[in-house]
């Protein structure tokens, strides 16, 4: 039978037939920065080119005792997971290995930097197709390592890294904390976070998604036909590097932002038991397990969005938190969240020619998070319209008045420490869907966008009785771009998007006042792009044989339980 | 994923512009910073990545590295330039005593300096 990890990342449509793409990833080159590898292993022979790059910390002179097989173990296994003939994800991908980790699996930030520089120079000397760089390593937070990753990503390289095995916040480690890198946590066959006593997968807002990372069968450096199981976030990252290679091979023009959005979109949602994560990290950690797309056809028309959480603001009264989208993404809405409920809302503001989402802490608050909804919207022209506090009893309102602009998100920000319980109307006037409504003492910010074929609608779900969580989801074919709460009273902790669902959290029901005061409405703005759908249909008509489904259907490959059939 | 995050240590060493009478003193008001790994056992003191400002050319990187060596030698310190970066980030990797950090932070074009640290297979 197919190994559990390959089954898990295979779309359901293909599972019954055990399809494995025969040459997935053939247009892509994957660089592996790791230990030395056994390049003559049958799994990877002819697929991995060992470069002459080596930069590792000195090993003890007495290390001649250490067998080469152990020195090669980590890297050989990962190369097999990415592109192995039998147990690999992207069986057609070619790889290049750089040795930056010694026999103990230890390296240095400087050695890794020089390795990344080597890749950039190789790319400049001999430009090839899409490049994926796999960094199955982690150290403490490093400004310089993150900066180097950022530069390489901006040069068009896709970087995939391990979240780390420290059972800790991934933001405390590098390159896991680099925003441009795709950071991968590890899950097991039960879709639960990988744990081993005091250690386990890292988590938190710096993780992009999870992937299989426990009991992963792959090439063993014991012998050229040997296999072994290994576990860790390196194995998880190798799965995502393989999936990325498959996607890029099917669509070589994908940008990093597009690839990341697709990885998120095609992931299995809400399968991880969040109880394993520390309570304060649950909301920040993506509940996503990576999977291959069923096909690339039909993906192009989607309006892809993801949620980006800021770092915590800290508890000082004037503290703020900022969430940013990637350079190629559009900020379509901005919300905020505070566990204590003490916050002063959020606003979208320009910073360095780009919109960012800023959340404001309040006096006595333990701090806030800013939550950006970042979307791929080609040819978009977005602006923020602001209405100052209205003072009138009807509350503050703002709408998109420019021709062809649609409302994608609403934010509200207030200077007063406590908005109190003055309740603005929950229902907005009929025939005016394009407006944001907020508390009369708050300034309201509307995100208004013009993009070809973009249409949006507002969806609300109100609960009259107090409840800790109110949700509203966009229906099939629509994408959540905005998520906010009505009213903006102090018992609302905040609002945030989880996949296509808008979640509004309120204070524990026992601490809220009367029923009327406890009423909360979750407001979702759902959008779709007719333009992208049309473009995708045209593309489908003009191209054939380039999608992942064609690769999938080209050949059926059996998983061989016993690997000594090579003899 | 934020850039300035975690219990990461940043030591800001103030510039004393009069020292050494540098011909190319850093622009007014900018302070180069020193960074090191917050996880003590992973620190590798004695090796430092000197990161220069974004638009610094390779020739300027090499010149800055030589200047550091010369100024260190005048103070009786031996330094070794292990690598000059270009292509991704401008800068250089230097093996030197931590006593020279204050001096290095005052060099022209320096954006920040980071002490080397360990990374591990995951």
């Amino acid at each position: 039978s197919i190994p559990w990890n390959l089954e898990r990342i295979t779309p359901p449509r293909y599972r019954a037939d055990e399809y494995q793409p025969p040459d997935g990833g053939s247009l892509v080159e994957v660089y592996l920065l790791d230990t030395s590898i056994q390049s003559d292993h049958r799994e990877i022979e002819g697929r991995v080119m060992v470069t002459d790059f080596e930069n590792v910390p000195e090993e003890d002179g007495t290390r001649f005792h250490r067998q080469a097989s152990k020195c090669d173990s980590h890297g050989t296994h990962l190369a097999g997971v990415v592109s192995g003939r039998d147990a690999g994800v992207a069986k057609g991908a070619s790889m290049r290995s750089l040795r930056v980790l010694n026999c103990q699996g230890k390296g240095t930030v400087s050695g890794t930097l020089i390795g990344l520089e080597f890749i950039r120079k190789s790319q400049l000397v001999q430009p090839v197709g899409p490049l994926v760089v796999l960094l199955p390593l982690a150290g403490g937070y490093s400004r310089v390592l993150n900066a180097a990753c950022q530069r390489l990503a901006r040069a068009g390289v896709v970087l995939v890294t391990a979240a780390g095995n420290f059972r800790d916040d991934a933001c405390l480690y590098s390159p896991a904390s680099a925003p441009e890198v795709i950071t991968v946590g590890a899950t097991n066959a039960q879709d639960q976070p990988v744990t081993l006593g005091t250690l386990g997968t890292n988590f938190g807002r710096c993780v992009d998604l999870f992937a299989p990372g426990e009991d992963i069968i792959g090439a063993s450096s014991d012998c050229s036909t040997c296999f072994v199981s290994q576990s860790g976030t390196s194995q998880a990252a190798a799965h995502v590097a393989g999936i990325a290679a498959m996607m890029l091979s099917a669509e070589p023009e994908l940008t990093l932002a597009e690839l990341r959005q697709r990885l998120i979109h095609f992931s299995a949602k809400d399968v991880i038991n969040e109880a394993w994560f520390p309570e304060d990290q649950r909301v920040l950690t993506p509940n996503l397990v990576a999977a291959l797309p069923p096909s690339t056809h039909g993906a192009g028309w989607q309006l892809f969005c993801r949620t980006v959480w800021s770092a915590h603001s800290g508890p000082t009264r004037m503290a703020t938190a900022v969430a940013r989208c990637a350079p190629d993404e559009e900020l379509l809405s901005c919300s905020s969240f505070s566990r204590s409920g003490k916050r002063r809302g959020e606003r979208m503001e320009a910073q360095g020619g780009k919109l960012v989402c800023r959340a404001h802490n309040a006096f006595g608050g333990e701090g806030v998070y800013a939550i950006a909804r970042c979307c791929l919207l080609p040819q978009a022209n977005c602006s923020v319209h602001t209405a100052p506090p209205a003072e009138a009893s009807m509350g503050t309102r703002v709408h998109c008045h420019q021709q062809g602009h649609v409302l994608t998100g609403c934010s509200s920000h207030w200077e007063v420490e406590d908005l109190g319980t003055h309740k603005p109307p929950v229902l907005r006037p009929r025939g005016q869907p394009n407006q944001c409504v907020g508390h009369r003492e708050a300034s309201i910010h509307a995100s208004c966008c013009h993009a070809p074929g973009l249409e949006c609608k507002v969806k609300e779900h109100g609960i009259p009785a107090p409840q800790e969580q109110v949700t509203v989801a966009c229906e099939e074919g629509w994408t959540l771009t905005g998520c906010s709460a009505l009213p903006g009273t102090s018992h609302v902790l905040g609002a945030y998007a989880v996949d296509n669902t808008c979640v509004v959290r309120s204070r524990d029901v026992s601490t809220t006042g009367s029923t009327s005061e406890g009423a909360v409405t979750a407001v979702a703005i759902c959008c779709r792009s007719r333009h992208l759908a049309q473009a995708s249909q045209e593309l489908q008509g003009s191209t054939s044989g380039s999608g992942l489904n064609d690769i999938f259907e080209a050949q059926k490959i059996e998983w061989h339980e016993h690997h000594h059939h090579h003899h | 994923q934020e850039d300035e995050d975690g219990d990461y240590e940043e030591l800001v060493l103030a510039l004393r512009s009069e020292e050494d009478g540098l011909a190319e003193a850093p622009e007014h008001g900018t302070t180069a910073t020193f960074h090191r790994c917050a996880k003590d056992p992973w620190r590798l003191p004695g090796t430092y990545v000197v990161v220069l400002k974004e638009e610094t050319h390779l020739s300027q990187s090499e010149r800055t590295a030589r200047r550091l060596q010369a100024q260190a030698a005048r103070r009786g310190y031996l330094t070794k330039i292990l690598h000059v970066f270009h292509g991704l980030l401008p800068g250089f990797l230097v093996k030197m005593s931590g006593d020279l950090l204050e001096l290095a932070l005052k060099l022209p074009h320096v954006d920040y300096i980071e002490e080397d640290s360990s990374v591990f297979a995951q």
Partner: antibody
């Protein structure tokens, strides 16, 4: 659950051979190396070697190299350790253990219950 | 072969005592040391992997430290079920080698 079940106690004469079996269950047998460790009465633990069940690859402690054979039968998820030319100082409890690799850390996470081998004339 | 020298070979302690067992390697084994507990007539059980990481289900009173050639297993507050023999083992190079063991007895 994951377990290793070993064959029963053996009494052998000097010069004879003994073959101890170790049946794995609860996991993919071909995914983990099986190591053999022995413990003489009142003594410490001594590593003998291992087999990678995905192939026939073995690695031995030089001390036992000429006398030990390690094999496996994947159809019944069983590993075997045969020690020949037995001497009285081979009297010991023989354990099989599964080696696990997590990150770059290696350890024996599952042990068999042990097989007592007594060598006596 | 790398020799792992464990000390003491035995010790007597009372419930609630803090117990420290040391292991010295004849050469640098980095952090590549595991610790096992064995009770009479039973198989060894993994306590600590890679010098300092507590294995699943192992009580927090057990901790490990060290790197290079010197390693320590500490039981912060000895419990009745902790009376057993403890072994260190290096996996840095073949052949794997174990320490001679430390028997922890009731005082």
């Amino acid at each position: 659950q994951v377990q290793l079940v070993q064959s029963g106690a053996e009494v052998k004469k000097p010069g004879a051979s003994v073959k101890v079996s170790c049946k794995a269950s609860g996991y993919t047998f071909t995914g983990y190396t099986i190591h053999w460790v022995r413990q003489a009465p009142g003594q410490g633990l001594e590593w003998m070697g291992y087999i990678n069940p995905s192939s026939t690859y073995t690695k031995f402690n030089q001390k036992f190299k000429d006398r030990v054979t390690m094999t496996r039968d994947t159809s019944i998820s069983t590993a075997y350790m045969e020690l020949s030319r037995l001497r009285s100082d081979d009297t010991a409890v023989y354990y099989c253990a599964r080696e696990r690799i997590y990150s770059n850390y290696w350890f024996f996470d599952v042990w068999g219950q042990g097989t007592t081998v007594t060598v006596s004339s | 072969d790398i020799v792992m020298t464990q000390s003491p070979s035995s010790l007597s302690a009372s419930v609630g005592d803090r117990v420290t067992i040391t292991c010295k390697a004849s050469q640098n084994v980095y952090w590549e040391v595991d610790w096992y507990q064995q009770k009479p007539g039973k198989s060894p059980k993994l306590l600590i992997y890679s010098a300092s990481n507590r294995y699943t289900g192992v009580p927090s009173r057990f901790s490990g430290s060290g790197s290079g050639t010197d390693f320590t297993l500490t039981i912060s507050s000895l419990q009745p079920e902790d009376f057993a023999t403890y072994f260190c083992q290096q996996y840095s190079s073949y052949p794997y080698t174990f320490g001679g063991g430390t028997k922890v007895e009731i005082k």
